[in-house]
């Protein structure tokens, strides 16, 4: 977990697709009866943008409290300020909550850089915008935190929806989902639309902003184009994945894939970047450089650090290359490639320059934890986080930001060989010697 | 080592086209290293950064005058121009043209200077 | 847009003393921030870069502190080379634009 990339810490394109298509979604998806891709109280239920998160309406107790809760797909806990703080417009009380059960236990989760500390209990939660269904889910009360909640971002707590084996403070606590899924016939599957800007928003416009959707239990065909392609997830911890080549303007960087999910790689809403193990972002950045050679831009720009601006609506996206990231698919060696664009790994910045500039940082980053498919990523796409069948769809986002020139892809099957080589075993800790 | 050397009439009337030259002498103004610029400085005032350009041809303008400033690359002669159209008085000021470089960054080595005065 | 606000507008002291001047960013910089010095009639000259490096050939009586919002240029002990103009610069948004108005050290 970095500080400035990983939420809540703030803080390329080869040839043409075989003849031969991947197994994807048509109907086939777990929906509830009656209910056949259209979710329409639940479109456009995310607000936010890419640099501070998305979050969505939540009440927690009775009566209900409702809070702005971050969507974190890179996480497992359901986590709530419930205490003052100067960034919190409001914070859960739990004193006020008829329904509220205390746990009488603890839970400390430290970050590289701050950490939040809470104690757990449950309670009664709902998503307004969401399945009209009422849950009872364990609930971390933030009693004090660091560097966890941002000034401005408007959420007031974060959602886990990654698996019980990285909730804190063991896999025994129940994430929220697990409880949703449980608790109702919600089926086993949510899916997200995260909808950037691609301009900057000042704060009035992102209170009035659509930031996007999440769908729970089901897919919202209104909510892509194309075909859904889909992924096999390697490990049900986070939502892990396996990449199988990079391409920058289709020029494969010709690594050791092993090396592109070293240690791993997972699809985290909570994450703003691209970010990528460290050979694997110095290949990448030198590919984007070179592509990108007509204009020179400072070291500190490609850190992600400096911004850098051109006159309202001139940006040269043109100079600046699509990158490709090849999937595992679903059969025996085939894979499917997604596309970003320069939109998306371009982050518009607010508030720097003159309203006559746009301004961006670069979204891509250096990674020590392995590969992770932020919110630069999803932007591009609609992903279907499909738990019950163990497997992430990918289809282009109809809220993409592109341009007239090119437009964010997923397209397959590719002819990959030895897929499962590229998955990387992290070393199991033999806790026997620990007792020593 | 490496020097710039400012160049133009010293006096322009209103309304009319401000033209000036950077002679890079000592090094390649085609050198990937760097970014060249104008910067301006109106008599007993501060500072202020007119605009940038690579020997590609890439230019970046300050928003404030943007409307008015063309900057331009002759990398056979080793030279930048700068071009400001529409001058009044309040473009009287000594106008240096300088390196960016550190990095980009960083406005690391200048020319003298040339004072240009608008009047009638 | 970033103002870089710089004080005190003036400075007098004697030589060998020690001189410090502030420059204040309106929002965060990072340590994209250099220190400029100019004399009368010359060109400014670049002193400090990245809020702490000293330029090629700037003597170590010059040193530069600071990062975000606030940064300082200090100088050691005052040389009477050193009386003139001095200007910050940030780069945090590029190309580099903004300068602050400048402290002039004068002799007191």
């Known amino acids: 977990t970095q500080h400035g990339i990983r939420l809540p810490l703030r803080s390329g394109l080869g040839g043409a697709p075989l003849g031969l298509r991947l197994p994807r979604e048509t109907d086939e998806e777990p929906e509830e009866p009656g209910r056949r891709g259209s979710f329409v109280e639940m479109v456009d239920n995310l607000r936010g943008k890419s640099g501070q998160g998305y979050y969505v309406e939540m009440t927690v107790g009775s009566p209900p409290q409702t809070l702005n809760i971050l969507v974190d797909t890179g996480s497992s806990n359901f986590a709530v300020g419930a205490a003052p703080h100067p960034f919190l417009h409001r914070y859960y009380q739990r004193q006020l909550s008829s329904t509220y059960r205390d746990l009488r236990k603890g839970v400390y989760v430290p970050y590289t850089q701050g950490k939040w500390e809470g104690e757990l209990g449950t309670d009664l939660v709902s998503i307004p915008h969401g399945p009209n269904v009422t849950v009872r889910a364990n609930i971390a009360a933030i009693t004090e935190s660091d560097k966890f909640f941002i000034n401005g971002s408007n959420w007031e707590g974060i959602l886990g929806l990654a698996y019980a084996e990285i909730a804190r403070p063991d896999d025994s606590l129940e994430p929220f989902f697990d409880s949703l899924v449980k608790q109702t016939h919600v089926p086993n599957l949510f899916s997200l639309q995260l909808c950037g800007a691609g301009f900057p928003l000042n704060q009035s416009e992102v209170l009035a902003s659509v930031g996007g959707s999440m769908i729970i239990g089901g897919i919202d065909h209104s909510l892509y184009t194309g075909s859904l392609w889909y992924t096999p997830i390697r490990r049900e911890w986070y939502y892990e994945v396996i990449i199988v080549r990079v391409e920058i303007n289709g020029q494969d960087l010709k690594m050791d894939c092993k090396e592109y999910n070293y240690d791993k790689s997972i699809v985290d809403s909570g994450t703003t970047n691209l970010r990528l193990p460290k050979k694997v972002f110095e290949a990448a950045v030198k590919s984007i450089k070179a592509a990108s050679s007509t204009e020179k831009f400072p070291d500190g720009f490609w850190l992600g650090e400096q911004l850098v601006c051109w006159q309202a609506g001139t940006t040269p996206w043109n100079i600046f290359p699509v990158i490709s990231l090849y999937l595992m698919g679903e059969v025996t060696n085939q894979s499917f490639r997604i596309t970003i664009l320069p939109q998306q790994y371009l982050r518009p910045v607010e508030d720097v320059a003159t309203s006559q500039d746009d301004c961006y940082k670069f979204a891509i980053s250096q990674s020590s934890t392995g590969t992770v498919m932020g919110a630069v990523i999803m932007e591009g796409f609609y992903v279907v986080f499909d738990r019950a069948r163990k497997r992430i769809g990918f289809a282009v986002s109809a809220c993409h930001v592109h341009d007239e020139f090119r437009t964010a892809a997923v397209e397959g099957p590719f002819v990959t060989l030895d897929m499962e080589d590229c998955g990387y075993n992290i070393p199991q800790t033999d806790e026997s010697t620990l007792m020593t | 080592q490496l020097q710039l050397q400012e160049s133009g009439p010293g006096l322009v009337k209103p309304s009319e086209t401000l033209s000036l030259t950077c002679t890079v002498s000592?090094?390649?103004?085609?050198?990937?290293?760097?970014?060249w610029g104008w910067i301006r400085q109106p008599p007993g005032k501060g500072l202020e950064w007119i605009g940038n350009i690579y020997y590609s041809g890439s230019t970046y303008y300050n928003p404030s005058l943007r409307s008015r400033v063309t900057i331009s690359v002759d990398t056979s002669k080793n030279q930048f121009f700068l071009k400001l159209s529409s001058v009044t008085a309040a473009d009287t000021a000594v106008y240096y043209c300088?390196?960016?470089?550190?990095?980009?960054?960083?406005?690391?080595?200048w020319g003298r200077g040339t004072l240009v005065t608008v009047s009638s | 847009e970033i103002v870089l606000t710089q004080s005190p507008a003036t400075l007098s002291l004697s030589p060998g003393e020690r001189a410090t001047l502030s420059c204040r960013a309106s929002q965060s910089v990072s340590s994209y921030l250099a220190w400029f010095q100019q004399k009368p009639g010359q060109a400014p000259r670049l002193l400090i870069y990245d809020a702490s490096n000293r330029a090629t050939g700037i003597p170590a009586r010059f040193s530069g502190s600071g990062s975000g919002t606030d940064f300082t240029l200090t100088i050691s002990s005052l040389e009477p080379e050193d009386f003139a103009v001095y200007y910050c610069?940030?780069?945090?948004?590029?190309?580099?634009?903004?300068f602050g108005g400048g402290t002039k050290v004068e002799i007191k």
């Open positions: 000592g090094g390649s103004i085609s050198s990937s290293s760097y970014y």
């Open positions: 300088a390196r960016l470089g550190h990095g980009y960054n960083y406005f690391d080595l």
């Open positions: 610069q940030q780069v945090y948004v590029w190309p580099p634009r903004t």
